[in-house]
């Protein structure tokens, strides 16, 4: 006997009624007196509801189940489960026996939406840039366990220190509390997104923090206008300076370097001491120069992934900030040239010349020229592939019809370093072989 149930779990909200669909195909002349229908919990075999000897035997499951008795004769063996609870979640088996028997299991997935998060800020008074605050996002009575995400005002993920706890109440519903510990910048919006993975429902909460300003005005912070260019593997200095007033002491200084976009903390100096690097231990301040207003940051062993904007926050009585861009670069290697075919070449033959240059950054510009430096307008295909470190290998292929003889040059330009790497191949005589013997 073939018994049909839905393949996908039945999703039911806590407190609502759910229908666990089950059907069979009755033969002509079928009467309910012939039917034995049993619903049971798949794992424990606990009886949930049964219909035998032509009668509904009723619910064996807290009086919360019912059959569609008027539809049974048409093969509808579905079960109605009322006032769904978290504890109902799981697999239910529908057994149908007439002359023969069949069974199938249907999954019930229980869900409950999370409440709109409430946000609390501690401390919530007299906040300054450089202060560490704790933001708590609380959302209640959801199911199943939530996924929690923190974002800034632009929707970028916040990578501060996050601790999330979820506690089930007596009904099995979860209360979620997520705590973000973050160092304040000049101002900012902090958003918490509580996602119900079953309902794909997001509950949002947010808080905007504007730290205290001084009546005496902002601190003026200077950074270079142009991007700082640094070679991969070398050290870079992101310059930042402020003008200390007479009597200034480092105990009054809050200095924060952070990634401009994500607000990720890079390095900080607060409460009169260097709090150290929060960026893979590759940053350092010029501590002996801080008191003179030098807030520059040293970034060691620069990587491609470091490229971007860094913000320097300086807070004394009041605060000021400025962003400096780091442009990462790596020189391209001298190109290696290959020629195909490379034997028995005649004028009029079509050849493919490949120019390969390695481990540069950013992406290169590639130019082909003849022996006189005039651009070659043959068929050129250039591809650039980044390796795990983000450095590019460039391969440029020139397809050209040979003249009597000629020089073909490839120029690989690094647009940031304005550095050109040259390679060339000269093809002479006929017949000719490459490389020359």
């Amino acid at each position: 006997l073939e018994v049909q149930v839905p393949e996908d779990p039945v999703v039911a909200l806590v407190g609502t009624d759910a229908t666990l669909r089950c059907s069979f195909s009755p033969e002509p002349g079928f009467s309910l007196a012939q039917l034995n229908l049993i619903w049971q919990l798949t794992d424990t075999k606990q009886l949930v509801h049964s219909f035998t000897e032509g009668r509904d035997q009723g619910s064996a499951y807290a009086n919360r189940t019912a059959l569609f008795l008027d539809l049974l004769a048409q093969g509808n063996a579905s079960l109605r489960l009322q006032r769904v609870r978290v504890a109902d979640e799981g697999s239910f088996t529908c057994f149908v026996s007439i002359r023969d028997f069949g069974s199938a299991a249907v999954s019930l997935q229980v869900a409950a939406p999370y409440s709109k998060p409430s946000m609390t800020l501690e401390p919530n008074k007299d906040l300054r840039p450089g202060d560490t605050v704790t933001i708590t996002c609380s959302s209640y009575r959801g199911y199943p366990e939530a996924e929690v995400f923190w974002q800034d005002g632009q929707g970028a993920p916040l990578t501060g220190n996050v601790t999330t706890s979820q506690m089930a109440n007596e009904q099995g519903l979860f209360d979620v509390h997520s705590v973000l510990r973050v160092v304040l910048g000049a101002n900012g919006t902090y958003s918490c997104l509580v996602r119900n993975p079953v309902l794909q429902q997001d509950a949002h909460g947010s808080i905007t923090i504007t730290p205290q300003r001084s009546p005496t005005g902002a601190v003026e912070v200077q950074v270079p206008e142009d991007p700082v260019v640094a070679l991969v593997g070398t050290d870079a200095t992101l310059r930042c300076s402020f003008s200390p007033e007479p009597g200034f002491s480092l105990a009054q200084l809050n200095l924060i370097w952070q990634l401009t976009d994500t607000k990720q903390l890079v390095h900080s100096f607060t409460e009169g001491r260097d709090q150290g690097s929060a960026y893979a231990n590759r940053t350092a301040l010029f501590l002996d120069l801080l008191a003179q207003g030098n807030a520059s940051l040293r970034l060691q062993r620069v990587r491609v992934a470091d490229e971007g904007s860094f913000t320097c926050f300086v807070s004394i009585r009041d605060f000021g900030s400025a962003a400096v861009s780091l442009q990462v670069a790596a020189p391209y290697s001298k190109p290696s040239m290959t020629l195909e075919p490379n034997k028995d070449l005649r004028p009029g033959d079509t050849v493919t010349i490949t120019c390969s240059s390695y481990r540069g950054y950013p992406e290169a510009e590639v130019f082909w020229q003849d022996g006189q430096g005039a651009p070659l307008t043959g068929n050129v295909t250039t591809s650039q592939m980044a390796n795990e470190q983000g450095l590019f290998d460039v391969h440029s292929v020139l397809r050209v019809v040979l003249g009597a003889n000629g020089t073909y040059s490839c120029l690989v330009r690094n647009p940031v370093l304005q550095q050109d790497a040259h390679g060339s191949v000269t093809i002479t005589g006929q017949p000719m072989t490459f490389p020359p013997e």
Partner: antibody, heavy 116, light 107 residues
């Protein structure tokens, strides 16, 4: 509601040490620095130092660097101050108070008496 | 350390009177000054921070002013429950330092 609970009194002998406690409730313990303040009878207030319960980072008033040691127990939301080599000069009321720049909640204070 | 000088050391005022207490600092602390009230046998309570911001729940007859090195606490319409010692405290530098206190009594 926010509460900082301190024992009412401690009596100790000169030369001994004592560990004063401050149990916090009603807020996130790791979100606020805990400060300790000394007040001698009919005298002013002296800031001893403070501790960040999150990572146990401390700052001390130089005058108390060799006298006081601040610790926390996050699991019980309790801050402690150990005072060593006690003399009659250490007899005072010691308060715990939460905050960085403003001390918005204070404990009731522990009266420390150093006497033989 | 920043020195805090509070004056007067004590004063008596009648109910309904206006009282002013001043606090001088040894160096510029901008606006980072707080005032605390301590009643006999009790712990101090925050009244005002950032020189002029009234703490939640504090009666509006209390007000603060000043910046730099000179600050004042004003109590309009003195009430019997205002009998206490008042302390100023700088929050500009570590160590935090307090004024010597002003004992306010009812006349």
């Amino acid at each position: 509601q926010v509460q900082l609970q301190q024992p009412g009194a401690e009596l100790v002998r000169p030369g001994a040490s004592v560990k004063l406690s401050c149990k916090a409730s009603g807020y996130t313990f790791t979100a606020y620095w805990m400060n300790w303040v000394k007040q001698r009878p009919d005298q002013g207030l002296e800031w001893i130092g403070r501790i960040d319960p999150y990572d146990s980072e401390t700052r001390y008033n130089q005058n108390f660097r060799d006298k006081a040691r601040l610790t926390v127990d996050k699991s019980s939301s309790t801050a402690y101050m150990q005072l060593s080599s006690l003399t009659s000069e250490d007899s005072a009321v010691f308060y715990c108070a939460r905050g960085v720049r403003i001390f918005d909640y204070w404990g009731q204070g522990t009266t420390l008496t150093v006497s033989s | 350390d920043i020195q805090m000088t509070q004056s007067p050391a004590s004063l008596a005022a009648s109910v309904g009177e206006t009282v002013t207490i001043t606090c001088r600092t040894s160096e510029n602390i901008d606006y980072t000054l707080a005032w605390y009230q301590q009643k006999p046998g009790k712990s101090p309570q925050l009244l005002i921070y950032n020189a002029n911001t009234l703490e939640d729940g504090v009666p509006s007859r209390f007000s603060g002013s000043g910046s730099g090195t000179l600050f004042s606490l004003k109590i309009n319409n003195m009430q019997p429950e205002d009998t206490a010692t008042y302390f100023c405290k700088q929050a500009y530098d570590v160590p935090r330092t307090f004024g010597g206190g002003t004992k306010l009594e009812i006349k």
